[in-house]
C-alpha cells in the first residue's frame, strides 16, 4: 500500500453540528478551569519539522494520547459534554487505527513526546489544559486528515 493512504478522515465527521458544538463546549468549560495561560500544547511547535503529508499521523498520536491519558482518566468531569465527546473521538481514533508512515518519524515522536511531557509535568492542570484545547485538536485533525 502507498504510504499514508489510511491517514484520512471523512469530512462528514467534522460536519455534524451537534457533536462539533459539544466538543467546543467541553473545550470552553475546561479552559475556564485552566489557570495556566502561558503554555500552549497544540500550536506551531507541535508541527515543527513535520511535512504536511505526515501531519495526520502526528495528530493520530496526539488524539490517542488525549483519549487514553487525559479524557478517560478525567471521564467523570465536565458533564454533560464529556460522555458525548469521548465516544466521538474514540470513533475518529478507530478510523485512524491503520494510519502509519513508512519514513522517518523522529521529528513526530520528538514533538509528541514534548507534548506528553508537558501534560505530565503539569499534572492535573495539564490534563485540564489538554481538554481545554480540544477545539484546537478538532481543527488540527480536520486540517491534517481530511
Amino acid at each position: 500500500l502507498p504510504v499514508n493512504t489510511r491517514c484520512k478522515l471523512e469530512v462528514s465527521n467534522f460536519q455534524q453540528p451537534y457533536i462539533v458544538n459539544r466538543t467546543f463546549m467541553l473545550a470552553k468549560e475546561a479552559s475556564l478551569a485552566d489557570n495556566n495561560t502561558d503554555v500552549r500544547l497544540i500550536g506551531e511547535k507541535l508541527f515543527r519539522g513535520v511535512s504536511a503529508k505526515d501531519q495526520c499521523y502526528l495528530m493520530k498520536q496526539v488524539l490517542n494520547f488525549t483519549l487514553e491519558d487525559v479524557l478517560l482518566p478525567q471521564s467523570d468531569r465536565f458533564q454533560p459534554y464529556m460522555q458525548e465527546v469521548v465516544p466521538f473521538l474514540t470513533k475518529l481514533s478507530n478510523q485512524l487505527s491503520s494510519c502509519h508512515i513508512s519514513g522517518d518519524d523522529q521529528n513526530i515522536q520528538k514533538n509528541v513526546r514534548r507534548l506528553k511531557e508537558t501534560v505530565k509535568k503539569l499534572g492535573e492542570s495539564g490534563e485540564i489544559k489538554a481538554i481545554g484545547e480540544l477545539d484546537l485538536l478538532f481543527m488540527s485533525l480536520r486540517n491534517a486528515c481530511v
Epitope: 467523570d76 465536565f78 458533564q79 454533560p80 464529556m82 460522555q83 492535573e124
Partner: antibody
Framework: QVQLHESGPGLVKPSETLSVTCSLS??????????WAWIRQPPEKGLEYIGR???????SYNPSLKSRAAISVDTAKNQFSLTLSAVTAADTSFYYC??????????WGQGTLVIVSS | QPVLTQSPSASASLGASIKLTCTLS???????IAWHQQQSGKGPRFLMR???????NKGDGIPDRFSGSSSGAERYLTISSLQSEDEADYYC?????????FGTGTKVTVLG
C-alpha cells in the same frame, strides 16, 4: 462478570489510620475506560463519596475528606486501596468500592463495616 | 457543585406503579444521573443511567419493570407492577465537577 470485594480491619482506634482494599475479579483494573471509587455510608444514613482513581494514577477526592484520604492502585494485584488518617467515631461506616463508567457508578462491592472505637 | 433533591418516602400497593423523582439544582439541569437501589441490610445496586433526553442505560439483570425518563431538571425512575422485593431505598447520583454527589434517598414501601 466483574466483581468487587472489599476487605478491611473491622475495628480501628480513634486517631489511627483506617485502611481498606478492594480486589477486582472478572476484569482488569487497568481498563482505561473505567475509574475506581470509594463511597461510604454510616449505619442508617445516606451515601457519601470519598474519591476515585484511574489506573494511570489520576486521582480526585471529596473536598471534605481530601486532607485525610489517600487512594492508590496496585495493577499487579488488581486492587485499589483507601487510607483515611486521624479517624474519629464519625468515620464509622460501611465502606464500598465501586466502578465508574463515564461518571456513573455501574458496579458496587458488597461493602465492609469499619467501626472506630477505643 | 450540583445538588440532588429526593423526597424522603413513597409508597404504592403490590402490583401498582410508582414514579420516583430526583431533581437537579439550578445550572445543572442537563446533567446525567444514575439510579441505585439499596435493599435493607445490603449494599447498593446500580439500576440505570438517565440523561437529559430521558434515554436510559440499565445495569445487568435489571428487570424491564424499571425504567427511566426525564423532564427539564427532573430525572425519574418508574417501577411498574411493584413487587415486594422492590421495597428499598433508592438513591440518585451525579458527577461532573471533580466530585460526585448523591441524593438523600427515597424509601419505597410496598403496601399490602
Amino acid at each position: 462478570q466483574v466483581q468487587l470485594h472489599e476487605s478491611g480491619p473491622g475495628l480501628v482506634k480513634p486517631s489511627e489510620t483506617l485502611s481498606v482494599t478492594c480486589s477486582l475479579s472478572g476484569g482488569s483494573i487497568s481498563s482505561s475506560s473505567h475509574l475506581w471509587a470509594w463511597i461510604r455510608q454510616p449505619p442508617e444514613k445516606g451515601l457519601e463519596y470519598i474519591g476515585r482513581i484511574h489506573y494511570r494514577g489520576s486521582v480526585s477526592y471529596n473536598p471534605s475528606l481530601k486532607s485525610r484520604a489517600a487512594i492508590s492502585v496496585d495493577t499487579a494485584k488488581n486492587q485499589f486501596s483507601l487510607t483515611l488518617s486521624a479517624v474519629t467515631a464519625a468515620d464509622t461506616s460501611f465502606y464500598y468500592c465501586a466502578r465508574l463508567d463515564m461518571g456513573a457508578i455501574d458496579k458496587w462491592g458488597q461493602g465492609t463495616l469499619v467501626i472506630v472505637s477505643s | 457543585q450540583p445538588v440532588l433533591t429526593q423526597s424522603p418516602s413513597a409508597s404504592a400497593s403490590l402490583g401498582a406503579s410508582i414514579k420516583l423523582t430526583c431533581t437537579l439544582s439550578s445550572g445543572h439541569s442537563n446533567y446525567d444521573i444514575a439510579w441505585h437501589q439499596q435493599q435493607s441490610g445490603k449494599g447498593p445496586r446500580f439500576l440505570m443511567r438517565v440523561n437529559n433526553g430521558g434515554s436510559h442505560n440499565k445495569g445487568d439483570g435489571i428487570p424491564d419493570r424499571f425504567s427511566g425518563s426525564s423532564s427539564g431538571a427532573e430525572r425519574y425512575l418508574t417501577i411498574s407492577s411493584l413487587q415486594s422485593e422492590d421495597e428499598a431505598d433508592y438513591y440518585c447520583q451525579t458527577w461532573g465537577t471533580g466530585t460526585h454527589v448523591f441524593g438523600t434517598g427515597t424509601k419505597v414501601t410496598v403496601l399490602g
